[in-house]
């Protein structure tokens, strides 16, 4: 499941880069797959919100819980907040097994 999600993510990032005019030398944060979910490219100062992966939302059907954010800073992406384990109830390592 996660291999398929990763492939879809890379396609989404490519499309987003084209739409936003992003390239490797653009300021901001490149889109990325972090082994759990997909993060679209972002400009510095932008906060991006993503939901816990659908696979795990059965454990957390509450719509305003199970949301993770990252800030795009001049140094790149911040750590996710909350961490996946606290927001979604599962760990990055679990998504790889």
């Amino acid at each position: 499941i996660f291999k398929k999600e990763q492939a879809m993510c890379l396609e989404k990032i490519q499309r987003a880069n084209e739409l936003m005019g992003f390239n490797d030398s653009s300021p901001g944060c490149p889109g990325m797959w972090d082994n759990i979910t997909c993060w679209k490219p972002a400009h510095v100062g932008e906060m991006v919100l993503v939901s816990c992966p659908e696979l795990f939302r059965i454990f957390n059907p509450d719509q305003d819980m199970g949301v993770v954010s990252r800030n795009c800073t001049e140094d790149g992406w911040s750590e996710p907040f909350p961490h996946y384990f606290d927001a979604c109830g599962f760990d990055e390592y679990e998504s790889e097994t």
Partner: antibody, heavy 123, light 107 residues
Framework: QVQLQQSGPGLVKPSQTLSLTCAIS??????????WNWIRQSPSRGLEWLGR?????????HYAVSVKSRITINPDTSKSQFSLQLNSVTPEDTAVYYC?????????????WGQGTLVTVSS | DIQMTQSPSSLSASVGDRITITCRAS??????LNWYQQKPGKAPKLLIY???NLQSGIPSRFSGSGSGTDFTLTINSLQPEDFATYFC?????????FGPGTKVDIK
């Protein structure tokens, strides 16, 4: 029915190591849906979460920054128990120590607790 | 660390009363909040998780509400066994932190 039974000394000398064990019955320390936590309680600091261990294909730990340099939480799969070690203790570490199981349903919560062990740090 | 505060720190009530305890977080925690009851010499006992979900086996006179930074535990028709200390706890970020407690005693 899940039960947590704590054991360990109630008196530890300053600079020594505090060691407590939490024996699990009715569940397994390797349960992939659970986390295994240590919490302490004192009049001066209230309830203080110290850290947790859990198994998700491999063992992982999270520790509170306040004790990170001194704490180790270890699982023992053969006995289905987990332990707390706190090094270089001072009288400020005097507290009632609890083990607890963490479970997930929309968030993490502590649904079963050990009976508590009063640990006094004194020479 | 996220700071949790509770009010009041203590309250006196009578059997049958409806009481409300408030918990406030120092930052937005959605509904990643739990409530516990503790009696002297005993371990805390889970009452409410996710701010508003009643733990199995807990009487329905206990209820939780709130989101964001402000939360409430309500006990309808206080019973003799409810005289205890109540704690809130956030679980959005480690270290998980607890409120200082609210002691409920007999008027």
């Amino acid at each position: 029915q899940v039960q947590l039974q704590q054991s360990g000394p109630g008196l530890v000398k300053p600079s020594q190591t505090l060691s407590l064990t939490c024996a699990i019955s009715g569940d397994s320390v390797s349960n992939k849906q659970a986390t295994w936590n240590w919490i302490r309680q004192s009049p001066s600091r209230g309830l203080e979460w110290l850290g947790r261990t859990y198994y998700r294909g491999k063992w992982k730990n999270h520790y509170a920054v306040s004790v990170k340099s001194r704490i180790t939480i270890n699982p023992d799969t053969s006995k289905s128990q987990f332990s707390l070690q706190l090094n270089s203790v001072t009288p400020e570490d005097t507290a009632v120590y609890y083990c607890a199981r963490g479970m997930w349903n929309q968030n993490w919560f502590l649904d079963h607790w050990g009976q508590g062990t009063l640990v006094t740090v004194s020479s | 660390d996220i700071q949790m505060t509770q009010s009041p720190s203590s309250l006196s009530a009578s059997v049958g009363d409806r009481i409300t305890i408030t918990c406030r977080a120092s930052q937005y925690i959605v509904r990643y909040l739990n409530w516990y009851q503790q009696k002297p010499g005993k371990a805390p006992k889970l009452l409410i998780y996710g701010a508003r979900n009643l733990q199995s086996g807990i009487p329905s006179r206990f209820s939780g509400s709130g989101s964001g930074t402000d939360f409430t535990l309500t006990i309808n028709s206080l019973q003799p066994e409810d005289f205890a200390t109540y704690f809130c706890q956030q679980s959005i970020q480690t270290p998980y932190t607890f409120g200082p407690g609210t002691k409920v005693d007999i008027k």
